[in-house]
Amino acid sequence: EVEKTACPSGKKAREIDESLIFYKKWELEACVDAALLATQMDRVNAIPFTYEQLDVLKHKLDELYPQGYPESVIQHLGYLFLKMSPEDIRKWNVTSLETLKALLEVNKGHEMSPQVATLIDRFVKGRGQLDKDTLDTLTAFYPGYLCSLSPEELSSVPPSSIWAVRPQDLDTCDPRQLDVLYPKARLAFQNMNGSEYFVKIQSFLGGAPTEDLKALSQQNVSMDLATFMKLRTDAVLPLTVAEVQKLLGPHVEGLKAEERHRPVRDWILRQRQDDLDTLGLGLQGGIPNGYLVLDLSMQEALS
């Protein structure tokens, strides 16, 4: 806490300008009017204040706005934003995407700090949903942003926003998140033709059910192995050898390299060995000929 001292004669700041870099901490505290600072915050970024001086300016704003800064001030915080605590930010009401962009720019190229996470949370809650422009902005700064949200939070993403999502934005999503995002993507891309649709939907297929995979197998999509390996195991298991062959097209040969990994391993265990043999890949572990394959769900129903 900077103790209150009178401003020396002739040093009262008439405007926020570079002359203030020559002021000591106590002089800034005594000679800079908080209301003047608030109206001229846009100048602060262009003045080479030391961080120690910025601490004083923050203190002055905190005193002026104990309930939280107005957006006109927030938009011009610049480096001062990094001096804010999550508690400070929770008091803010940020509604402008331009303000959000300005603050994200300060932290650009670095992992999401607690301040940024709090800011984004406040912004999204204020908007009520993750609209396309917001999602565009957030994923541009933080490609992993989408996958940091809970399935509950993702449920507020409107299908129209899915157009802003790039494949790399989904790299760290788990199956629960893709379960929520896939139906939205399916809806968003529903009017596209086959090959274009597949290109767009591909990154979301980790949330696709069996029936959608069966439908894709009829469309000559040539799914790559990397995408296949990310599919839900429970969605892959009911697929027939013929369906998998059609789904993967020329990439079917890649199954051999993945035969010990899920979901390929579990799928192999469900197939007849003679069906697997038709692939000519030497896949082993299928059900030997002559054995009865009982659908487990049927078995439970019979017992």
Epitope: K25, N45, A46, G78, Y79
Partner: antibody, heavy 123, light 115 residues
């Protein structure tokens, strides 16, 4: 005439700590009107300001966001020098490192520079 | 988009003038910023030349000839370093810098060749 003389190793192993020192002659590290900066230069990143130390009734350090979590700058008043420590280095930290004085009267323009130390991060 | 953009190279003849520009990213108005200029020759550290905020607020480095001067081009949102009466010893890399949000930010540099 103010001079800055740098010292420190030219080769650092990945994940280790890079330590460099900048000895000041003709000015004081405790000056109330100067800041003491570290800057690095590499072909991929160009000139990059890393941080500074300065005395204004007590010592302060400011760091660039890019290195804040793994960098420290320490003044040594008895030897009139300041040092840089950069932890957990990677090949990306390979660069020429410079120390420089920022003068308040030049609005912290950096008017005096050390000779530079070429640091290679490699195993 | 970087905060400061400089054209990578420029060639000029001895005795002529060279104008080196330093463009600020859109959204950052050059108006209130002080632009600092440095010269660097191969194997040497950068050398402070001058800083420029306005015609009435500029500072030449100690011993820097008056052939080196600063200005701003508001329409291009840029700082400008003007070198008049070019000499062979002016052949070097030139860097602009600003203090932005209390951190020093450098441009990518312009390599000036004196033909």
């Amino acid at each position: 005439q103010v001079q800055l003389q740098q010292s420190g190793p030219g080769l650092v192993t990945p994940s280790q700590t890079l330590s460099l020192t900048c000895a000041i002659s003709g000015d004081s590290v405790s000056s109330n009107s100067a800041t003491w900066n570290w800057i690095r230069q590499s072909p991929s990143r160009g000139l990059e300001w890393l941080g500074r130390t300065y005395y204004r009734s007590k010592w302060y350090n400011d760091y660039a966001v890019s290195v804040k979590s793994r960098m420290s700058i320490n003044p040594d008043t008895s030897k009139n020098q300041f040092s840089l420590q950069l932890n957990s280095v990677t090949p990306e930290d390979t660069a020429v490192y410079y120390c420089a004085r920022g003068m308040m009267t030049y609005y912290y323009g950096m008017d005096v520079w050390g000779q530079g130390t070429t640091v290679t991060v490699s195993s | 988009q970087p905060v400061l953009t400089q054209s990578s190279s420029l060639s000029a003849s001895p005795g002529a003038s060279a104008s080196l520009t330093c463009t600020l990213r859109s959204g950052i108005n050059v108006g209130p910023y002080r632009i600092y200029w440095y010269q660097q020759k191969p194997g040497s550290p950068p050398q402070y030349l001058l800083n420029y905020k306005s015609d009435s607020d500029k500072q030449q480095g100690s011993g820097v000839p008056s052939r080196f001067s600063g200005s701003k081009d508001a329409s291009a949102n840029a700082g400008v370093l003007l070198i008049s009466g070019l000499r062979s010893e002016d052949e070097a890399d030139y860097y602009c810098m600003i203090w932005h949000s209390s951190a020093a930010v450098f441009g990518g540099g312009t390599q000036l060749t004196v033909l």
